[in-house]
Interface confidence: low
């Protein structure tokens, strides 16, 4: 009778991470009598993944009944496989010896393979907010993935990016990957409302590629632009003086007025309006009795815009003009407020 | 095509260190273990030292004459594996070969070698 | 340590004889697992040595038929039974059964 052959008829076998693999194994003969054993790798080190002698092997189920006298069908299922279950499965046949059974036979082993899903990439992007035409770095990792090919694309508002560097580690073998990748985006003033999209294409993913995306509104800065008008009130020796605050974001920002120089009221942006590009427009007036200035008044609109250094806009107010009270020693209005 | 290239050979002094790498390709690395096998006219071939896999907690084995003094170590995300060397001696001259055993489960060989690396151990 | 002797240390033979190299390990060298990982390799001059015979007797693929490797317990036997050009070298024993790992000390196989 010719000799027991061990048959591993598939020299791989792809399997998804969570789904089961089946890999199959014959013996053309019945004779030696012995068992069944999987092994995992080759050499002194293989790993034990089935015995069909004795031991406890909760994720191994065997496709045939084993205890069946003429059963040849050795091939088993391991279920639930993930990423780290890849590598090389042999099926080998033992001869009953005594006091151990002898190895006797091994079939020419089944890589495995494991497909696995890369994570949500999660997209970042950098620590300080930056102004209009500075470039900004993105970031966009994915992880726990295999095989190791994958796309990365990055856009802009649906607009492909260019500028952009991809890792995908660890370049030798392994169970599974992460994909890295750095963008350079360019800000203008209409990216307020702009968003950076990472898309990441893998075998797994069947044609729908996995999205993480980054809002630019938590990026840019646009810093205001200010402009302060002169207005007539209908008591000749009250003066209107408005300090218009355009297209600014985010919306944190403190006011403050100066006469000559010495603070006359801080206030804070409340009540703005919003621009059709996300960026926020707001208005404070002051109410100025010029009855109390002996000589002209420079009126100071001083803006700090999210913590940064101040920036001002000055109004000479020329008294000359209003001769009528000039002596009055009557305060100076005060109050004021914002207008929608 | 299976592969190993060594390197990190050279002359060092005695009493000195010195690193050999072996990087692996054409075969699934993690799957077996890995050797350094050593070469002179004096001493002819002599095996030193292996790596078993993660699934053995990489355990580690040695010749007698290296103990304590070389450390062999893998990893597997480089495909690589290495032979830390200290304390070398003249005696330690010679070629070093990487070598793995593959293909069959039950029939274990060393059967992949890489082209050797010589290092030279003198004053 | 297991210790392998190899003889002869040279073989000199004529192209179409037969050659025998004979391997004798210190202790029996049977696996646990009940296997003797006994191996034959082949260097030529500037490579590294090439794996011919594993666990006594087999073949390594792509290895000629008139390689044969006998032998049991502490006795080995590698037999060419027609030497060919490519043949010649050095021939070592190795013991893969039991740590330490170890070669015999080489049998250098040239022409008569």
């Known amino acids: 009778e010719e000799e027991l052959q061990v048959i591993q008829p598939d020299k791989s076998v792809l399997v998804a991470a969570g789904e089961t693999a089946t890999l199959r194994c014959t013996a053309t003969s019945l004779i030696p009598v012995g068992p069944i054993q999987w092994f995992r790798g080759a050499g002194p080190g293989r790993e034990l993944i089935y015995n069909q002698k004795e031991g406890h092997f909760p994720r191994v189920t065997t496709v045939s009944d084993l205890t069946k006298r003429n059963n040849m069908d050795f091939s088993i299922r391991i279920g639930n496989i993930t990423p780290a279950d890849a590598g090389t499965y042999y099926c080998v046949k033992f001869r009953k010896g005594s006091p151990d059974d002898v190895e006797f036979k091994s079939g020419a082993g089944t890589e495995l393979s494991v497909r696995a899903k890369p994570s949500a990439p999660v997209v970042s992007g950098p620590a300080a907010r930056a102004t209009p035409q500075h470039t900004v770095s993105f970031t966009c990792e994915s992880h726990g993935f295999s095989p190791r090919d994958i796309t990365l694309k990055w856009f802009k508002n649906g607009n492909e990016l260019s500028d952009f560097q991809t890792n995908v580690d660890p370049v030798g073998e392994s169970v599974s990957y992460s994909i890295h990748s750095t963008a350079k985006v360019v800000l203008t003033r209409e990216d307020v409302h702009s968003q950076v999209i990472c898309e990441v294409a893998h075998v797994t993913l069947q044609g729908d590629p996995l999205r993480g995306t980054a809002n630019l509104s938590e990026t840019i800065r646009v810093p205001p632009t200010l402009e302060v008008t002169q207005q007539p009130v209908r008591a000749e020796n009250q003066v209107n003086v408005t300090c218009q605050v355009r297209k600014f974001y985010p919306q944190r920002l403190q006011l403050t007025w100066l006469e000559n120089g010495n603070v006359s009221r801080t206030e804070t942006a409340s009540t703005v309006t919003e621009n059709k590009d996300g960026t926020y427009n707001w208005m404070s007036w002051l109410l100025v009795n010029v009855s109390a200035h002996r000589d002209d008044v420079k009126l100071t609109c001083q803006v700090e815009h999210d913590g940064q250094p101040a920036v001002s806009k000055s109004h000479d107010l020329k008294v000359s003009a209003h001769p009528k009270e000039q002596g009055s020693n009557t305060a100076a209005e005060n109050t004021g407020s914002n207008e929608r | 095509e299976v592969k190993l290239e060594e390197s990190g050979g050279g002359l060092v002094q005695p009493g000195g260190s010195m690193k050999l790498s072996c990087v692996a390709s054409g075969f699934t690395f993690r799957n077996y273990w890995m050797n350094w096998v050593r070469q002179s006219p004096e001493r002819g071939l002599e095996w030193i030292a292996e790596?078993?896999?993660?699934?053995?907690?990489?355990?580690?084995h040695y010749a007698e004459s290296v103990k304590g003094r070389f450390a062999i170590s893998r990893d597997g995300s480089k495909s690589s594996f290495y032979l830390q060397m200290n304390d070398l001696r003249a005696e330690d001259t010679g070629i070093y070969y990487c070598?793995?055993?593959?293909?069959?489960?039950?029939?274990?060989?060393?059967?992949?070698w890489g082209a050797g690396t010589t290092v030279t151990v003198s004053s | 340590d297991v210790l392998m002797t190899q003889t002869p240390l040279s073989l000199p033979v004529s192209l179409g004889d037969q050659a025998s190299i004979s391997c004798r390990s210190s202790q029996n060298i049977v696996h646990s697992n009940g296997n003797t990982y006994l191996e034959w390799y082949l260097q030529k001059p500037g490579q590294s040595p090439k794996l011919l015979i594993y666990k006594v007797s087999n073949r390594f693929s792509g290895v000629p038929d008139r390689f044969s490797g006998s032998g049991s317990g502490t006795d080995f036997t590698l037999r060419i039974s027609r030497v060919e050009a490519e043949d010649l070298g050095v021939y070592y024993c190795f013991q893969g059964s039991h740590v330490p790992f170890t070669f015999g000390s080489g049998t250098k196989l040239e022409i008569k």
């Open positions: 070598t793995t055993f593959t293909k069959v489960v039950a029939d274990w060989h060393l059967d992949v």
């Open positions: 790596i078993s896999l993660k699934s053995n907690t990489y355990a580690t």
